[in-house]
């Protein structure tokens, strides 16, 4: 029997420093968590004390803090090297700065493979980025060698943006003819790493014949076998065990995001290459673990330039941007709005001519909405001044939910109105009406969405059973603020990009903002 | 087939710069890194510097950052070193090649030979 | 600057011997190390990269291994065409740094 330990971490989203528990920026040192540094300290303890070791990373390093806004994937190249990743596959958010901002920084100066079997190019891209990435790769471990198929979401060209010269395939489609290569090959030990989500990932283990381990990235799914070390709650036991359609028993693992672990598994193969048993749980890097010194010396040369970068101007008002509780926790107010308009530009995505964009709508809790910026300071706008309106770190996500899950969200965002709660929600692509004079539950009395498959947007009623789109901050997409029916029954939820980062880089492309407050949400007394 | 053609010979006056020049084919020019390596006669090798097609970005080995300049045209897919002040120091061969994917040095020209002779 | 030192400088070997050429980093370099083979008037070709993982199109005679400052390429059975100067190169850290070369003769 040859044992081979595998070390992976997925969604990592530019969490290159050590970070507080949920993620956010670490205040606390001694209760932070993850980092770069940290990581490599458990990497290099692991491989010193095991003989065949290999570390990959399933997609998303890219975007998630000031990190990939300032650097733009240079420190994800720098820091993966520095931690001799070997291989990663390539995640959907590896496309937010165009194929461009993925090639310069990062397809060309990393110094491991970059995988993904399902992504195909075409037209004058196809010559241009013709093995910077690969379908698969065969590395050698100890005296075997193992065989590493990577994979895409499909959904990516929703999600990000790869232009239109990329061909995102069926996963499974994909995949198995290169697994059938790797065979021909004499490759007996098969890794299919990927980020197509923690469903996917099962049905990868189930369908193509050959792969003989699956991680996955995407969902930040969280598996752990006895009792978990932190606050995430286990969706299966460590590794998910899958049983193939050929009668095999696939291990499928992933582990959470940003970090904050260290996905450990151990695999025992015969000589036949099948697997004879696969055990492990992620480690959480907590600070118990030391910080590695000349990982976190070279972390904090680099730090330098993002304290610069978050005092530059982005971009100015001229309005006063109302920012207050006072105002965003009780009607509409234009930072709400603005940070709505922001979210949508910042999906915007012409995939289909029926449709002027994928998504129009926009929702957002007003008590995320933390400060406002006058704009008596010259009007300027720096990063500093976002972080005090957006301080939690969190992301913009695309969900998919049914018209009547709305309408319950909407109802949610009134039903103890007056209270100064921070489930009032700011809009973007919808027109409500509140009677607060109806029983709490029955106070939406109009409700009405930008239409999407038109040319001429224009707002149409709210149809119950139809699906629609949403933008939202991933704090609702997880039922925060009492939005328990959104993370309920949301039919699709993909991570997106970072809240800060969207506004910036919308504030940078007007120049000049001037949001106002426009009617998007209206109160009204008695029969409409 | 991917090539990077070098020419075979160049011979200068002390004193005088040369530009050697390495002409890309068979793959998108401005997709990878192209590095320049310095073989003296009978010696091992040594590498100059490196530059970036698409952007023009260049590194450096400090002992050549005056004696080197690299550039690229883009329209004819070539690489040039301009080696300036030679001396007697500066006959070798020079060598192009390509940084491939994971630093894979993939592909290299033929070299050019440089005699430094008055 | 990282200096590579190779040993030995040049040895002599009889076909079908297994071939142990060492290199040795000033410092830690990651496992980036590179080998590569020349003969006389050619230019370099390259054998393995990342320590370990073998160029395509190279015989599987040929084989890599080494951590931290430590390195070696292991030729399992020496064949004629083996024959020629071999170099290490590390590309951790600019500037990259070859070794002096091991020359290798048919004994």
């Known amino acids: 029997a040859w044992e081979l330990t595998i070390l992976h971490t997925n969604d990592v989203h530019s969490r290159l420093e050590q970070t507080s528990e949920d993620s956010s920026k670490c205040v606390n040192a001694s209760r932070c968590m993850g980092g770069v540094a940290r990581l490599f300290t458990k990497v290099q303890q692991i491989r010193r004390a095991e003989p065949n070791v290999l570390l990959l990373d399933a997609g998303d390093q890219y975007q998630g803090t000031i990190w990939f806004t300032v650097y733009k994937g240079a420190e994800v190249a720098h820091f993966m090297n520095a931690l001799r990743y070997d291989a990663m596959a390539l995640g959907n958010h590896e496309f937010d700065n165009g194929v461009e901002g993925l090639i310069e920084p990062l397809l060309k100066e990393a110094k491991f493979p970059i995988l993904s079997a399902n992504i195909k190019a075409k037209g004058p891209l196809a010559s241009q980025i013709s093995g910077l990435y690969l379908p698969y790769k065969v590395l050698p471990v100890g005296d075997e060698v193992v065989g590493i198929v990577g994979y895409t979401s499909k959904e990516t060209p929703f999600l990000s943006n790869p232009g239109t010269n990329l061909v995102f395939e069926d996963e499974i489609t994909a995949l198995q003819p290169e697994v059938d290569k790797l065979k021909t090959l004499n490759v007996n030990k098969i890794i299919a790493l990927g980020h197509s989500g923690f469903e996917m990932d099962k049905l990868i283990a189930q369908k193509v014949r050959g792969v003989d381990v699956v991680v996955g990235g995407h969902s930040n799914t969280f598996l752990y076998t006895g009792n978990p070390p932190s606050k995430e709650v286990p969706a299966g036991k460590y590794p998910f065990i899958v049983t193939s359609d050929d009668g095999r028993k696939v291990p499928v693992v992933q582990a959470y995001a940003f970090g904050k672990y260290l996905g450990y598994l151990k695999i025992e193969f015969d000589e036949r290459g099948n697997v004879i048993s696969s055990h492990g749980n992620p480690i959480l890097l907590n600070s118990s673990i030391p910080e590695d010194p000349s990982i976190k010396a070279d972390i904090n040369k680099w730090r330098i330039k993002l304290d610069n970068y978050s005092t530059q101007e982005l971009g100015k008002t001229i309005v006063y941007l109302d920012g207050s509780s006072q105002s965003c926790r009780f009607r509409e107010c234009n930072m709400g709005n603005l940070i709505c308009d922001a979210m949508i530009n910042n999906n915007l995505r012409h995939t289909d001519e029926m449709f002027w964009n994928h998504v129009s709508m926009c929702i957002l809790n007003g008590g995320g909405i933390r400060s406002p910026i006058d704009e008596r300071n010259n009007g300027t706008i720096t990063w500093e001044n976002l972080a005090a309106v957006l301080p939690f770190g969190g992301t913009f996500d695309l969900v998919q939910l049914k018209g009547s899950t709305l309408k319950k969200a909407f109802e949610h965002s009134v039903h103890r109105y007056g209270q100064s709660t921070g489930e009032f929600l700011q809009v973007g692509g919808i027109h409500v009406v509140y009677d607060l004079s109806r029983k709490p539950g029955d106070r939406v009395v109009k409700l009405d969405v930008l239409c999407t498959k038109c040319r001429v947007p224009s707002y149409d009623p709210l149809k119950m059973d139809e699906v629609y789109k949403v933008i939202l901050p991933n704090f609702l997409a997880n039922g925060g603020d009492g939005f328990q029916m959104i993370k309920d029954e949301l039919l699709r939820h993909d991570s997106g990009d970072q809240d800060i980062n969207v506004v910036s880089t919308y504030i940078s492309k007007m120049k000049v903002i001037y949001p106002a407050v426009e009617g998007r949400i209206k109160f009204s007394t008695g029969s409409h | 087939q991917v090539q990077l053609q070098q020419p075979g010979t160049e011979l200068v006056k002390p004193g005088a710069s040369v530009k050697l020049s390495c002409k890309a084919s068979g793959y998108t020019f401005t997709s990878y890194y192209l590095y320049w390596v310095k073989q003296r006669p009978g010696q091992g090798l040594e590498w100059i510097g490196g530059?970036?097609?698409?952007?023009?970005?260049?590194n450096f080995n400090e002992k050549f950052k005056t004696k080197a300049t690299l550039t690229v045209d883009k329209t004819s897919n070539t690489a040039y070193m301009q080696l300036s002040s030679l001396t007697s120091e500066d006959s070798a061969v020079y060598f192009c090649t390509r940084r491939g994917s994971s630093w894979n040095f993939d592909v290299w020209g033929a070299g050019t030979t440089v005699t430094v002779s008055s | 600057d990282i200096k590579m030192t190779q040993s030995p400088s040049s040895m002599y070997a009889s076909l079908g011997e297994r071939v142990t050429i060492g290199c040795k980093a000033s410092q830690d370099i990651n496992s980036y190390l590179s080998w590569f083979q020349q003969k006389p008037g050619k230019s370099p070709k390259t054998l393995i990269y990342?320590?370990?993982r073998l160029v395509d199109g190279v015989p599987s005679r040929f084989s890599g291994s080494g951590s931290g400052q430590d390195y070696s390429l292991t030729i399992s059975s020496l064949e004629y065409e083996d024959v020629g100067i071999y170099y290490c190169?590390?590309?951790?850290?600019?500037?990259?740094?070859f070794g002096a070369g091991t020359k290798l003769e048919l004994k």
């Open positions: 530059i970036n097609p698409s952007n023009g970005g260049s």
């Open positions: 190169l590390q590309y951790d850290e600019f500037p990259l740094t």
């Open positions: 990342r320590t370990n």
